[in-house]
Amino acid sequence: LSVQQGPNLLQVRQGSQATLVCQVDQATAWERLRVKWTKDGAILCQPYITNGSLSLGVCGPQGRLSWQAPSHLTLQLDPVSLNHSGAYVCWAAVEIPELEEAEGNITRLFVDPDDPTQNRNRIASFPG
């Protein structure tokens, strides 16, 4: 089982939307896949996928989950608020037929205030 997560860094304006993608690949077929998104180490949601469907469509405040076969799990935050800023990690585990787990690398989300004057110093702190 392997998990690739992206992007590494995401900077968005407050009130817009942010999309985090997790690609989950497994050499053999799986019957049930447990997935988990965390923010700063705290669990946002922990649904499972079976028969091609997610057991849960929401993930944390203003978060929506989707599964696109064969391998893409997407977390969409809309609208984004300042407290969405943080470090997000996607984790996956094949529960059936046999346990195997993996996690992605961190996606760092920075949310800029809607008022650009509040943001002048922060942009200088996070170039690019």
Epitope: S2, T28, A29, I49, A69
Partner: antibody
């Protein structure tokens, strides 16, 4: 690019242990998402997957070989190895190492194979 | 274990003609979770290791000529060579990776008529 090379004795006596090593070049066997397999081809051309060791050191074996087979690795040498105990003439075959990935689950790179004969 | 049954055992086809090889699995190789069929096709030429032609039942590996066509779903799969070339002779194998143990078909020997 990745290359695999099998090595080991070409003749093994019945009831002894067959030991082969696959040396991987151009790619680390610890790379996440990759599996390192042993496959054998019998004289009649039939192919049999024997088992794999994955990037984390986890293994999976063909139940048809019962508890006779062990696959291990040496990451410092970028090698993985096969041990098959209690061999008989029925284990005479060409033994190949091969790799596949989670993302593209097919055997995309194979060694050229080494012929092993079990005979006294 | 999933049993892979190939037919025919051998096949002789004239150059430029169509060759068809079948593979039947003892259980479905389709997953609704991934919308994939876990089936591969290989060609083994004399003195060489098998080389992948088709994966996920119908996806040609980059560099494989488009005369090689994989089709089918579930338990019934077909490899078609639309116009046989001299370099296509060899042994063809189907292989599943739905679960472990991974298993291969017994092969189909393709020759020029």
């Amino acid at each position: 690019q990745v290359q695999l090379q099998e090595s080991g004795p070409g003749l093994v006596k019945p009831a002894q242990t067959l030991s082969l090593t696959c040396t991987v070049s151009g790619f680390s066997i610890s790379t996440s998402g990759y599996y390192w397999s042993w496959i054998r081809q019998f004289p009649g051309k039939r192919l049999e997957w024997m088992g794999y060791i994955n990037y984390g050191g986890g293994t999976s074996y063909n139940p048809s070989l019962k508890s006779r087979v062990t696959i291990s690795r040496d990451t410092s040498k970028n090698q993985f190895s096969l041990k098959l105990t209690s061999v008989t003439a029925a284990d005479t075959a060409t033994y190949c190492c091969a790799t596949m990935a989670d993302r593209f689950a097919f055997f995309d790179v194979w060694g050229q194979g080494t012929m092993v004969t079990v005979s006294s | 274990d999933i049993v892979m049954t190939q037919s025919p055992d051998s096949l002789a086809v004239s150059l430029g003609e169509r060759a068809t090889i079948n593979c039947l699995s003892s259980q479905s190789l389709f997953s609704s979770n991934t919308n994939r069929n876990y089936l591969n096709w290989y060609l083994q030429k004399p003195g060489q290791s098998p080389k992948l032609l088709i994966y996920h039942a119908s996806t040609r590996l980059s560099g494989v000529p488009d005369r090689f066509i994989g089709s089918g779903s579930g338990t019934d799969f077909t490899l078609t060579i639309s116009s046989l070339q001299a370099e296509d002779v060899g042994d063809y194998y189907c292989q599943h990776h739905y679960e472990t143990p991974l298993t291969f078909g017994d092969g189909t020997k393709l020759e020029i008529k």
